[in-house]
């Protein structure tokens, strides 16, 4: 392995790695202008002070310029996410300059050494940007730095060191170890660009988190709570236990941030929306599906600049693969019990029937516990656009379909052996769509038949309600 570079010493010493066998001094950071979507096309290497490659490779001074910054590497070769991202940027922004920052010599080290090298690499990018700014028509406002993992903090340093302010930095699951909780000058922060948006996909709440948990941008988006990504479970990744390791699962969750960003570039017709919320638990309870006061936003490339916000945590659910978009619904369900069923924690499912499609049987996730004689809020989501909701079916699972449900049933029985007739009354369900912000109320057809017990189902149809009438327009007309 190459010799690690420490954080000390002159910048010039750190950017060059002399070798006895070398006839010329090579920089440790290269800027590869990708002139084609084709990964086999070698592109052009740009270097500070050399204008000829800019002309030879048709660098467009007035266009957007993307700098893609990779992270720590154990292989010393670019992973496939980079190829996908380059291709997606070329597809979406045909005239843009796409530059891959190759700092492999400084990233293919022990993790701690690679971390110590991030500052130097950030400095190198800043020097390149300062030089480009000397050219006519080049604007720092058109620069978008996209950093993955350790590369996100490199982007932060670059934004910090450059003369002026770069237009945007996107942090794709910024690295956690050695950055969590540190001073803003030593990690990505909202001060590093005019707009800093961040996707967090692998922020474990226990132990060592590969991705940074804390918010570090103007908006910080935590898909699926920022931890367990659908399609990245042990069985999903490995397919069969014979092939694969925990590292594949880690890669899947960490790299998901990149794929969500790629999705936002190539699936413009299916933009994913995130909703501001104080924490993941509240979001899972369906409390945070509001778009008032800029509380929702597109994710990835299409995110709307929100300079007034700092460290604004936003959440969304996604599918397991591209396109990642899902449709979020908030359900407000008033549950009443005459016989005071105490600890009854029913296993409930809802099926939504819409003008375009019907949903699957969706579980109502009980985040804390169901409050009886009170309104409970739930979050459900569908992979398909159901259109206008027409009716819904609520089911209380009777037979235990899992060990967890069996335990629940047993616990319920122990707590109330003398009261086997567990019964809930639900007269109406209020539904709000996150994507359209429309609110609709559903009632039982016969108000006298609003009870449900284990193994039973209850049907709800659209009904008049004051809530529904308040809001008829979609706030996403100008967002999409």
């Amino acid at each position: 392995s190459p010799v690690p570079f420490g954080p000390e010493g002159r910048l010039e010493d750190k950017l060059h790695k002399p070798k006895a066998t070398q006839t010329e001094v090579k920089p440790s950071v290269r800027f590869n202008l990708r002139t084609s979507k084709d990964p086999e096309h070698e592109g052009c290497y740009l270097s500070v002070g050399h204008s000829q490659p800019l002309e030879d490779c048709s660098f467009n001074m007035t266009a957007k310029t993307f700098f893609i910054i990779h992270g720590w590497t154990m292989s010393g070769i670019f992973e496939n996410w980079l190829h996908k991202l380059v291709s997606a940027l070329h597809t979406r922004e045909k005239d843009a300059n796409v530059v891959v920052v190759d700092w492999l010599p400084l990233a293919h080290q022990l993790y701690t050494d690679a971390v110590n090298n991030t500052r130097v690499v950030g400095h190198s990018i800043a020097r390149m940007l300062d030089w480009l700014q000397e050219k006519d028509d080049f604007s720092l406002g058109n620069v978008h730095l996209i950093g993955y993992s350790l590369g996100a903090h490199v982007a932060g340093y670059a934004g910090n060191f450059v003369k002026g302010t770069v237009g945007r930095i996107t942090g794709l699951d910024p690295a956690g170890p050695m950055f969590e909780g540190v001073d803003i000058n030593r990690r990505l922060s909202p001060d590093d660009a005019d707009f800093v948006d961040v996707l967090h996909t692998y922020t474990l709440s226990f132990g060592l988190s590969i991705g940074i948990r804390m918010p570090v941008g103007h908006i910080d988006i935590y898909p699926n709570g920022g931890d367990f990504q659908p399609g990245c479970g042990f069985n999903d990744v490995i397919g069969s236990f014979a092939y694969g390791t925990i590292s594949e699962m880690v890669k899947c969750e960490h790299e998901r941030a990149v794929h969500l960003f790629v999705d936002s570039l190539v699936n413009q017709d299916k933009p994913s929306f995130a909703f501001q919320c104080t924490d993941s638990s509240r979001f899972k309870r369906g409390i945070c599906l509001s778009c008032r006061k800029n509380r929702c936003n597109n994710i990835g490339y299409n995110a709307k600049k929100m300079r007034k916000k700092r460290n604004s945590k936003m959440y969304l659910k996604t599918r397991a693969g591209m396109p990642f978009k899902v449709y979020h619904y908030q359900l407000k369900v008033h549950m009443f019990s005459y016989n005071n069923s105490g600890d009854t924690q029913p296993t409930l499912y809802i099926t939504l029937y819409g003008s375009n499609a019907d949903s699957q049987n969706l579980p109502l996730e009980i985040v804390e516990k169901i409050e009886l004689n009170a309104t409970n809020t739930f979050l459900v989501y569908t992979e398909e656009d159901l259109g206008d909701l027409l009716k819904m079916r609520l089911t209380w699972e009777g037979v235990a379909h899992s060990w967890y449900n069996l335990w629940n049933e047993f616990r319920n029985y122990l707590s109330q052996p003398s009261n086997p007739s567990r019964e809930l009354y639900i007269r109406r369900i209020r539904v709000k769509s996150g994507e359209t912000q429309r609110k609709v109320t559903f009632c039982t057809q016969d108000p006298t038949k609003s009870s449900i017990s284990p193994g039973q189902e209850l049907w709800f149809h659209k009904c008049q309600d004051g809530w529904k009438m308040k809001n008829k327009t979609s706030p996403f007309v100008n967002l999409a």
Epitope: P2, K17, S28, P39, E42, N80, H108, G239, Y243, E248
Partner: antibody, heavy 120, light 107 residues
């Protein structure tokens, strides 16, 4: 024209070491990676590892971690693979191949192969 | 490691025939599948990259297709120089792995 010229056949005794060379021409040596592949007699191909000539960074298949050492000499655009503690299991044809900068890049040009025979 | 399986180890065909060689991966390899030709003298050449992209200088009678875990190489209108061994290789995950090869011989 891209070319990878490998060193000639080797006949060695068990326990010995050997250094196979692969001289690149027709392209900028530091813009691609060099990979080594083993083909045992009448068998499939096995990836041994690669080296990035730009800075000398290497990555080996776990199976060959203690067997192969990869190096480059940028001044002569030559890549080397040293195989140590040779046994009859190491008898095979060894190829060097050029690859682009991504995992997904194919091995677009191959050397002619170096036959290694290990026999007492 | 990802296992690459070429179920047909040997295939006989005549000049002018159309043949298809298949390759299966033990998990989804996202179309990062390359095909190589090895001649009896040991010479190895790239034919197709990224499932279907023809390498420069390779005749158009060679084509590739597939997705997920299943891929194939088709040679239409076989010519004498096509009789060789064909290997598939995945570029999705380290370590890079190859199929066991399919030897195409003259009938």
């Amino acid at each position: 024209e891209v070319q990878l010229q490998q060193s000639g056949p080797e006949l060695l005794k068990p326990g010995a070491s050997v250094k196979i060379s692969c001289k690149a021409s027709g392209y900028t040596f530091t813009d691609n990676t060099i990979h080594w592949v083993k083909q045992s007699h009448g068998k499939s191909l096995e990836w041994i590892g690669h080296i990035n000539p730009y800075y000398g960074g290497t990555n080996n298949n776990e199976k060959f971690k203690d067997k192969a050492t990869l190096t480059v000499d940028k001044s002569s655009s030559t890549a080397y693979m040293e195989l140590r503690s040779l046994t009859s299991e190491d008898s095979a044809i060894y190829y060097c191949a050029r690859k682009g900068i991504y995992y997904s890049s194919p091995f677009d040009y191959w050397g002619q192969g170096t036959t290694l025979t290990v026999s007492s | 490691d990802i296992q690459m399986t070429q179920t047909t180890s040997s295939l006989s065909a005549s000049l002018g025939d159309r043949v298809t060689i298949s390759c299966r991966a033990s998990q989804d390899i996202n179309n990062y599948l390359n095909w190589y030709q090895q001649k009896p003298d040991g010479t190895v050449k790239l034919l197709i990259s990224y499932t279907s992209k023809l390498h420069s200088g390779v005749p158009s009678r060679f084509s590739g297709s597939g997705s997920g875990t299943d891929y194939s190489l088709t040679i239409s209108n076989l010519e004498r120089e096509d009789f060789a061994t064909y290997f598939c290789q995945q570029g999705n995950t380290l370590p890079f792995t190859f199929g066991s090869g399919t030897n195409l011989e003259i009938k």
